[in-house]
């Protein structure tokens, strides 16, 4: 029960996290104009990974895409790559984890296979979360560097009457969305890895023991209630020794229409 809950929760947390990573990647507010030095501006600038926008006081917003690949800073390209890798890994992880969920039965899939898939998706979520956190952090670092550089340059060239106020940019909403989403994906991945340990069959060796009764020759094997007792055909019966503790509803039977959720 705890394993199912952990796995399910890990999946949901990762799902929210990946949705957040996608949202952050698409958002335009990665960097927003710092209004501390110029709080009276009637034009508000903000930038994303894919385009830069200007919002005028009328509410009119104009966005222009970065229609160049080679002309963009290497750091921006790196951030884009990290976010895309994070999304791709996260999406694959989600796909894998859906089939790994304990509550979903697909054919006669073994628990060991589900455990492996859970671990795989968990690792994918962890890497996905780390990619997002790394991408956002690289961008944030770039902003901080540029912020202080522009602050140093801000008061230069003011010898005459004319002033040129340089636009400085600070952290946008997308950075916080990205950090939180990356963290959630990471947590979800860890939970999936923890759930995997509970799913994996334990290496418990129960030796087959033969009991020779005087009247009958019935061999009790790890397979459960079989041999000549008449229970062999009842595949729904609870198995006694099968490596790990299971409840009746977890016993795999031949696929039926109810097995595919």
């Amino acid at each position: 029960m705890a394993v199912t809950a952990c796995q399910g929760l890990g999946f949901v947390v990762s799902l929210i996290g990946i949705a957040g990573i996608i949202a952050a990647t698409c958002m335009d507010q990665w960097s927003t104009q710092d209004l501390y030095n110029n709080p009276v501006t009637a034009v508000f600038n903000y930038q994303g990974l894919w385009r830069s926008c200007v919002r005028e006081s009328s509410g009119f917003t104009e966005c222009r895409g970065y229609f160049t690949l080679l002309g963009l800073p290497a750091m921006l390209q790196a951030v884009r790559a990290l976010m895309i890798v994070g999304i791709v890994l996260g999406a694959i992880g989600l796909l894998v984890s859906i089939f790994a969920l304990k509550c979903i039965r697909i054919g006669s899939m073994e628990d060991s296979a589900k455990a492996n898939m859970t671990l795989t998706s968990g690792i994918m979520f962890i890497v996905s979360g780390l990619c997002a956190i790394a991408g956002v952090s690289v961008f944030a670092n770039m902003l901080v560097t540029n912020f202080w550089m522009s602050t140093a340059n801000m008061y230069t060239g003011m010898g005459g009457m004319v002033q040129t106020v340089q636009t400085r940019y600070t952290f946008g909403a997308a950075l916080f969305v990205g950090w939180v989403a990356g963290g959630l994906t990471l947590i979800g991945g860890v939970m999936m890895c923890i759930a995997c340990r509970g799913l994996a069959p334990e290496e418990t060796n129960y030796k087959a023991v033969s009991y020779h009764a005087s009247g009958h020759s019935v061999a009790y094997k790890p397979g459960g209630f079989k041999a000549s007792t008449g229970f062999g055909s009842n595949t729904k019966n609870k198995k006694i020794y099968d490596g790990g503790a299971r409840t009746e509803d977890e016993v795999q039977s031949y696929p039926s229409k109810h097995d595919y959720v």
Epitope: A42, V43, N45, S57, S58, E62, V165
Partner: antibody, heavy 120, light 113 residues
């Protein structure tokens, strides 16, 4: 057709208050910010402030802060400019002007103006 | 506050001649985000409210004759009337649309010689 119709001329005594109205028609009232600008006789234009009829947000020129209040009545598509503690230098023609949506923050339509005379 | 300075204060030209009005701002009106200049030009005839002629330093408002042209960037702007007509007699104002408080130039009075 966009129209901004302002209230009639006012004569006030120093220290009194005046409330000028500007009724908008021909467009969606809440979609456009309304600015107020004044012009003293024979002088240039001076920006007073603006009101956003959508959310009642306002911004004032520091020069007038504390003395000017901009309000709006959505039901009648009217904006009001109230100026208190009037002095003789407040004698001017007061204009309401609509901020254009795609005009780079420029005012595309203006009211006919309201002359406010402050005299003892 | 951004100070807008117009020159000349008054201008007298003959009908059909070119008129040039200059406007200088104390701070750049060029927005780095979209490389647009936030400056407008207005025409005010006696007893009338101002009328928008040019916005964004160079974009003509709809209905404005094409003899009116705006140019310039950053801190220096120009309004040019290529062939002055009798109905162009008015006071012309430039306006900072970039930062609050919005400020206007002192005005340039155009007369016919």
């Amino acid at each position: 057709e966009v129209q901004l119709v302002q209230s009639g001329a006012e004569v006030k005594k120093p220290g009194a208050s005046v409330k000028v109205s500007c009724k908008a028609s021909g467009y969606t009232f809440t979609s456009y910010i309304m600015h107020w600008v004044r012009q003293a006789p024979g002088q240039g234009l001076e920006w007073i402030g603006y009101i956003n009829p959508y959310n009642d947000g306002t911004k004032y020129n520091e020069k007038f802060k504390g003395r000017v209040t901009l309000t709006r009545d959505k039901s009648t598509s009217t904006v009001y400019m109230e100026l208190s503690s009037l002095r003789s230098e407040d004698t001017a023609v007061y204009y309401c002007a609509r901020l254009g949506f795609t005009t780079r923050n420029a005012m595309d339509y203006w009211g006919q103006g309201t002359l406010v005379t402050v005299s003892s | 506050d951004i100070v807008m300075t117009q020159s000349p204060d008054s201008l007298a030209v003959s009908l059909g001649e070119r008129a040039t009005i200059n406007c200088k701002s104390s701070q750049s009106l060029l927005n780095s985000g979209n490389q647009k200049n936030y400056l407008a030009w207005y025409q005010q005839k006696p007893g009338q409210p101002p009328k928008l002629l040019i916005y964004g330093a160079s974009t003509r408002e709809s209905g404005v004759p094409d003899r009116f042209t705006g140019s310039g960037s950053g801190t220096d702007f120009t309004l040019t009337i290529s062939s002055v007509q009798a109905e162009d007699v008015a006071v012309y104002y430039c306006q900072n649309d970039h930062s609050y408080p919005f400020t206007f130039g002192q005005g340039t009075k155009l007369e016919i010689k």
